[in-house]
């Protein structure tokens, strides 16, 4: 018979011979030849692979460093890498998340649009006409200004988008 | 048939550089690693290192790292180990042998002399 | 590095006799073991691989056995192209390493 051009799924083509790759977990010690099969062993502790595959050296796990706040949020298997994410107040600086960076606070005048998570920053967003944020802040959203009216009071003084109105009693006219 | 034919034996001084040939044939060169053992006389076997023609890729015993150099030349299927810094301790015969992890097929073996 | 640790270093035995030679790895292997023969001034030649696979071509009188730490190749009877020099190897991880050989002489 013709030797192979192309092998199956799973098998790849050495020396005019279709082999049998590595399962995931497993590495290659020795190629298939004529007359022998392929032979592949576990990685070992802290080492994956996670396709099959014809590797002579499993990769190590991921280590999450404590020192870049880093830590882990998966732990790895002889089929998956390890998964890091950072700690509480923290956000990575890339999607590989191999650092982290404290939450930004918004600044008064703009409010929190959505609160940081483990994989990314804080959203902030300038506070509309009729709202105020008076603090920096990586939670508070804006404030709306508070309703003079409904305590049956006056506007005093203008809200900004930092600061809320100032309410007061109304002048009442004496007939 | 797998064949593997190795360079002749050498004689070199202490201090100097040795370059062993093994030339292949019988099989596609690319898909086959080529390691080197090495036998001192009336001694045991040691692993010097593979190299994967189809690659480039090398792995080398730590032993022998900074001195060894593994290369191939794929238009003659030919695999080339160099040790550098000789001393008379690396008196052996060096064999190639392919395939990865067992050695189904071996070089006659090179003997390599150190000697001032 | 694992260090494998063959005996006896040297045996005599007559022909037919069964003769067993043991190798001992420093730490687990699995089945990656291979033995070769040796004759004076001779390459190895490959005869079990993966701890009991017999290689192509080689006499069924040859067999191997073993996993983890402990491993054993027997010549069940003998032959006169039998004496020679046995050796164990590991290629579960790097380096490879050998046992030191076992030379089976005449008696």
């Known amino acids: 018979p013709e030797p192979p051009t192309a092998c199956r799924e799973k098998q790849y083509l050495i020396n005019s011979q279709c082999c049998s790759l590595c399962q995931p977990g497993q590495k290659l010690v020795s190629d298939c030849t004529e007359f022998t099969e392929t032979e592949c062993l576990p990685c070992g502790e802290s080492e994956f692979l996670d396709t099959w595959n014809r590797e002579t050296h499993c990769h190590q796990h991921k280590y999450c460093d404590p020192n870049l706040g880093l830590r882990v949020q998966q732990k790895g298997t002889s089929e998956t890498d390890t998964i890091c994410t950072c700690e509480e107040g923290w956000h990575c600086t890339s999607e590989a998340c191999e650092s982290c960076v404290l939450h930004r606070s918004c600044s008064p005048g703009f409010g929190v649009k959505q609160i940081a998570t483990g994989v990314s920053d804080t959203i902030c967003e300038p506070c509309p006409v009729g709202f105020f944020s008076n603090v920096s802040s990586a939670f508070e959203k804006c404030h709306p200004w508070t309703s003079c009216e409904t305590k049956d009071l006056v506007v005093q003084q203008a809200g900004t988008n930092k600061t809320d109105v100032v309410c007061g009693p109304q002048d009442r006219l004496r007939a | 048939e797998v064949q593997l034919v190795q360079s002749g034996a050498e004689v070199k001084k202490p201090g100097s550089s040795v370059k062993v040939s093994c030339k292949a044939s019988?099989?596609?060169?690319?898909?086959?690693?080529i390691n080197w053992v090495r036998q001192a006389p009336g001694q045991g076997l040691e692993w010097i290192g593979w190299?994967?023609?189809?690659?480039?890729?090398?792995y080398c015993n730590e032993q022998f790292k900074g001195r060894v150099t593994i290369t191939v030349d794929k238009s003659t299927s030919t695999a080339y180990m160099e040790l550098s810094s000789l001393r008379s301790e690396d008196t052996a015969v060096y064999y190639c042998?392919?395939?990865?992890?067992?050695?189904?097929?071996w070089g006659q073996g090179t003997l390599v002399t150190v000697s001032s | 590095d694992i260090q494998m640790t063959q005996s006896p270093s040297s045996l005599s035995a007559s022909v037919g006799d069964r003769v067993t030679i043991t190798c001992k790895a420093s730490?687990?292997?699995?089945?990656?073991v291979a033995w070769y023969q040796q004759k004076p001034g001779k390459s190895p030649k490959l005869l079990i691989y993966?701890?009991?696979n017999r290689y192509t071509g080689v006499p069924s009188r040859f067999s191997g056995s073993g996993s983890g730490t402990d491993f054993t190749l027997t010549i069940s009877s003998l032959q006169p192209e039998d004496f020679a020099t046995y050796f164990c190897?590991?290629?579960?991880?790097?380096?490879?390493?050998f046992g030191g050989g076992t030379k089976v002489e005449i008696k």
């Open positions: 042998a392919s395939s990865l992890g067992k050695f189904a097929y």
């Open positions: 019988g099989y596609t060169f690319t898909d086959y690693y």
């Open positions: 993966s701890a009991s």
């Open positions: 190299i994967f023609p189809g690659s480039g890729s090398v």
């Open positions: 190897q590991q290629y579960s991880s790097y380096p490879y390493t």
């Open positions: 730490q687990s292997v699995v089945t990656a």
